[in-house]
């Protein structure tokens, strides 16, 4: 069964700056990744970035840099200034659309006890939804 993992890290240098990393553990080819915050995409969450493996990347504030890390994982840096900046308990979600598995989404937030610059290892987050 495919899994999606989500890792959220607060940057030591900028305490209101976050890095979100997401990955897809499955055999299919990824056709789209959507990163949102405040809940799952389409369920109250606000889209931060949409990444297509070949067409390109679209991102919106406070997202500063979305990029592919590997063929099955992405990262997103969030700028921590202004009214729309994230806080420590913000939930971030990543939805991977892949063929032939369908869509798989998982969410994560900053570990409660984490120090700036540290984070839990990127273990699979609970899968919230699988749309086949």
């Amino acid at each position: 069964t495919p899994e999606v993992w989500v890792q959220v890290r607060m940057e030591a240098t900028e305490l209101s700056s976050f890095t979100i990393r997401c990955g897809f553990l499955g055999s299919g080819s990824i056709s789209l990744v959507t990163v949102s915050w405040g809940g799952p995409n389409g369920a109250g969450g606000t889209t931060l970035a949409v990444l297509h493996p070949e067409r390109g990347i679209r991102q919106w504030a406070p997202a500063r840099q979305a990029r592919w890390e590997t063929q099955s994982s992405i990262s997103l840096i969030l700028e921590g200034s202004g009214a729309s900046s994230p806080c420590a308990n913000t939930t971030f979600c990543c939805k991977f659309a892949s063929f032939p598995e369908g869509s798989w989404e998982a969410c994560g937030s900053l570990p409660p006890s984490s120090d700036p610059g540290l984070s839990a290892p990127p273990t699979p987050a609970p899968i919230l939804r699988a749309d086949l």
């Epitope: 959507t34 606000t46 889209t47 949409v50 297509h52 493996p53 070949e54 067409r55 390109g56 990347i57 679209r58 919106w60 504030a61 990029r67 592919w68 890390e69 590997t70 063929q71 994982s73 992405i74």
Partner: antibody, heavy 114, light 113 residues
């Protein structure tokens, strides 16, 4: 198949504003950004910016910041581009586009002339 | 901003012959993470909006004839029409899809010789 249908041609006076609409059908309007691109007569393509209808999040080309506003109405699946303080060099065909420029509207000619 | 420069500005090719258009970007369009080049090619005929031909430097958009092909990596890219047809007369644009703002080349006008 996504279809984008734009509003008709406009003739405007210098200093005024124009608002161009782009109605989408056949796809999920809120999932992908609506891009705006303009093309002056005989010239190339110039990206103006984009709006993500689901959240009204926007990105603007620095060249147009302060003069252009993107809005979207999810209830009618329509995106809007408003350009203010028009000058003669804004005479161009304005296009909306979606899904990484895979789908395009037919274009709206805006003529700025006194 | 990434500057896209196409060559030549115009090109005349006989029907059935090969047409080649080059595009050079001022910065690399290669995403090192997934080894994909974020470059697209468009065809525009008079009075019509641009039509997406190629994305990811080499992937044909659905419905595009296989005589159109894209190649290249990093900063140097090529659009090739293997056997020119009358309906291919148009202006062709390359586009940076790698970073904001998306920027287009100045265009290459393709005509029949």
């Amino acid at each position: 198949e996504v279809q984008l249908v734009q509003s008709g041609a406009e003739v405007k006076k210098p200093g005024s504003s124009v608002k161009v609409s782009c109605k989408a059908s056949g796809g999920t309007f809120s999932s992908f950004s609506i891009e705006w691109v303009r093309q002056a007569p005989g010239q190339g393509l110039e990206w103006m910016g984009e709006i993500l209808p689901g959240s009204n999040s926007t990105n603007y080309n620095e060249k147009f910041k302060g003069r252009v506003t993107f809005t979207a109405d999810e209830s009618t699946s329509t995106a809007y581009m408003e350009l203010s303080s028009l000058r003669s060099e804004d005479t161009a065909v304005y296009y909306c586009s979606s899904y990484w420029f895979a789908y395009w509207g037919q274009g709206t000619l805006v003529t700025v002339s006194s | 901003d990434i500057v896209m420069t196409q060559s030549p500005d115009s090109l005349a090719v006989s029907l059935g012959e090969r047409a080649t258009i080059n595009c050079k970007s001022s910065q690399s369009l290669l995403n090192s993470g997934n080894q994909k080049n974020y470059l697209a090619w468009y065809q525009q005929k008079p009075g019509q909006p641009p039509k997406l031909l190629i994305y990811g430097a080499s992937t044909r958009e659905s419905g595009v004839p296989d005589r159109f092909s894209g190649s290249g990596s990093g900063t140097d890219f090529t659009l090739t029409i293997s056997s020119l047809q009358a309906e291919d007369v148009a202006v062709y644009y390359c586009q940076n899809a790698h970073s904001y703002p998306p920027t287009f080349g100045q265009g290459t006008k393709l005509e029949i010789k």
